[in-house]
């Protein structure tokens, strides 16, 4: 969590002389409470925007905004504390609105807003905005809270974000799955536009059973500059059992940017439609299917890696 | 001293009901997401259900959704859990515990443990 | 949702030995993974989080690392104290799932 560059930020509007200052989280008139105390914020909202810093990196930030209750207690405002909290970590950061002068009511409604709490991708947060000074220790709450979750990297505005892209979002592998003959599944993928490794995971299941029954990895040499935005071939040979045949496949780029963390694709091929006259599955079958994998034997394709290759190479 | 401290643990039939209570100490409570796991008699750890600071966030693992509900006062430092239409696989050591700033979760209670059987 | 495996489910070694846990997460969690050590009959204790970062208080013989979808605890010499049940837990986002746990004993 972090605050959108170090400009100046600003809260002032006409008829009101405000400061934005960092914030422990922990307002003084928690320590030392106020008899007379605000109402709490009305309408609290939390949206989605962009905003670019100083380098010209796009980030997704919180757009956060609120109204005032029209009572006579914002005359006792002095300020208000933004806090967002990153539900995974707990992390937490704040800002205080510090007023320098007094509000005073005029025909419209006070309204409020800050655009300046950078969030990550996928990341769920709780945003508090609590009207300063905070309430005695058994007054009404002054604070309004909301949750916020922050769409991932595949949502379409998302994915032209500087943390995004890093991860490899623009990248479009098109992954394309065909079933041979022999036991054999094609994937083919487009290559990206950088000479990069790739691994291509496969993972089959029976279609009753959550359990996987058998996966390999397939690794991909980093393409030379002729082969980028080519399309790569990886052919698998699949599980003897025909019931070992629900299939998903992962493609994993090691893009720079991202290394082990970048964005990976998936596809999922399920199991063909059996007809009634089609043959039990034996018991003797299932034998192998549930033998403990020593840590060591996930990847049972090390002797197999000679059928992965670039398209242009057939 | 950081200290949790559950309660409300108890032998109860199928179909029943416990609420658990959570007690902190030592801690600003108000400022921490909180969290609630359980242990199966000689099984591993089941994340149950976490509830943010100001209760505006809030998530239940699939096992006990629509029959759990996890419930917090900052006024009286307390979380709690209750535990509704229970069946006997909730039978469980039902911790509490508050999550480390930067991950993963650092202080937690010792248990109280929950038996359904008929 | 995201599936956490850990391998081995058992491991039984000499005392100052190298003991490595793998956990693997069925997607990318990044780097928001945690271990934790549990003694028997007693309470969970966090030993590493954000993947590689030491608990304070912690012995420096515990380390983490890993990233992705692949992560790894490792022991630079086991010690008769470090008898124990270990988890990995994966905190991403919501359902913050654990691992099935490596149970770890001296030979």
């Known amino acids: 969590l972090r605050l959108l560059d170090h400009r100046a930020l600003v809260c002032s509007q006409p008829g009101l002389n405000c400061t934005v200052k960092n914030s422990t989280c922990l307002d003084d008139s928690w320590i030392h409470p106020r008899n007379l105390t605000p109402s709490s914020p009305k309408d609290l909202q939390i949206q989605l925007h962009f905003a670019h810093t100083q380098q010209g990196d796009l980030f997704p930030v919180a757009h956060i905004e609120w109204t005032l209750q029209t009572d006579a207690s914002i005359l006792y405002l002095e300020g208000a504390e933004l806090s967002v909290l990153q539900l995974n970590t707990n992390e937490r950061l704040c800002v205080k609105f510090q007023f320098l002068s007094m509000l005073q009511h005029h025909r419209k409604r006070w309204r409020f807003s800050f655009s300046h709490f950078v969030v990550d991708p996928g990341q769920e947060y709780e945003v508090t905005v609590h009207h300063l000074p905070k309430p005695i220790p058994d007054g009404d709450p002054n604070h309004q809270s909301k949750n916020f979750l922050v769409p991932d990297c595949e949502h379409a505005r998302m994915k032209v974000t500087t943390p995004c892209m890093s991860s490899g979002s623009l990248w479009d592998p098109n992954i394309t799955v065909e079933t041979l003959e022999a036991h054999q599944l094609r994937v083919s993928f487009t290559l990206w536009n950088e000479s990069t490794p790739y691994q291509v995971l496969l993972e089959s299941f029976s279609d009753s059973e959550n359990h996987s029954c058998f996966d390999v990895v397939k690794q991909i040499f980093a393409p030379r500059q002729e082969e980028f935005h080519q399309r790569a071939n990886v052919t698998f040979t699949l599980s003897k059992f025909h019931w070992c045949c629900h299939h998903h496949v992962q493609v994993q780029p090691f893009f720079s940017s991202c290394l082990n963390d970048c964005l990976r694709h998936a596809v999922t091929v399920p199991c063909p439609v059996i007809s009634n006259t089609t043959v039990p599955k034996p018991v003797a079958d299932y034998i192998p299917l549930w033998e403990p994998r020593s840590g060591s034997s996930d990847y049972k394709d090390d002797d197999d890696k000679g059928s992965s290759h670039h398209h242009h190479h057939h | 001293e950081v200290q949790l401290v559950e309660s409300g643990g108890g032998s109860v039939q199928p179909g029943g009901s416990l609420r658990l209570s959570c007690a902190a100490s030592?801690?600003?409570?108000?400022?921490?997401?909180m969290n609630w796991v359980r242990q199966a008699p000689g099984k591993g750890l089941e994340w149950v259900s976490i509830?943010?600071?100001?209760?505006?966030?809030?998530h239940y693992a699939d096992s006990v959704k629509g029959r759990f509900t996890i419930s917090r006062d900052n006024a009286k430092n307390s979380l709690y859990l209750q535990m509704n239409s229970l069946r006997d696989e909730d039978t469980a050591v039902y911790y509490c515990?508050?999550?480390?700033?930067?991950?993963?979760?650092?202080?937690w209670g010792q248990g109280t443990t929950v038996t359904v059987s008929s | 949702d995201i599936q956490m495996t850990q391998s081995p489910s058992s491991l039984s070694a000499s005392v100052g030995d190298r003991v490595t846990i793998t956990c693997r997460a069925s997607?990318?969690?990044?780097?928001?993974l945690a271990w934790y050590q549990q003694k028997p009959g007693k309470f969970p204790e966090l030993l590493i989080y954000?993947?590689?970062t030491l608990q304070s208080g912690v012995p420096s013989r515990f380390s983490g690392s890993g990233s992705g979808t692949d992560f790894t605890l490792t022991i630079s010499s086991l010690q008769p104290e470090d008898v124990a049940t270990y988890y990995c837990?994966?905190?991403?986002?919501?359902?913050?799932?654990f691992g099935p746990g490596t149970k770890v004993d001296i030979k």
């Open positions: 954000a993947a590689s």
């Open positions: 997607q990318g969690i990044s780097n928001y």
């Open positions: 030592g801690f600003t409570f108000s400022s921490y997401s």
């Open positions: 509830i943010s600071s100001r209760s505006s966030i809030i």
């Open positions: 515990a508050r999550p480390k700033v930067g991950g993963g979760m650092d202080v």
């Open positions: 837990q994966k905190y991403n986002r919501a359902p913050f799932t």
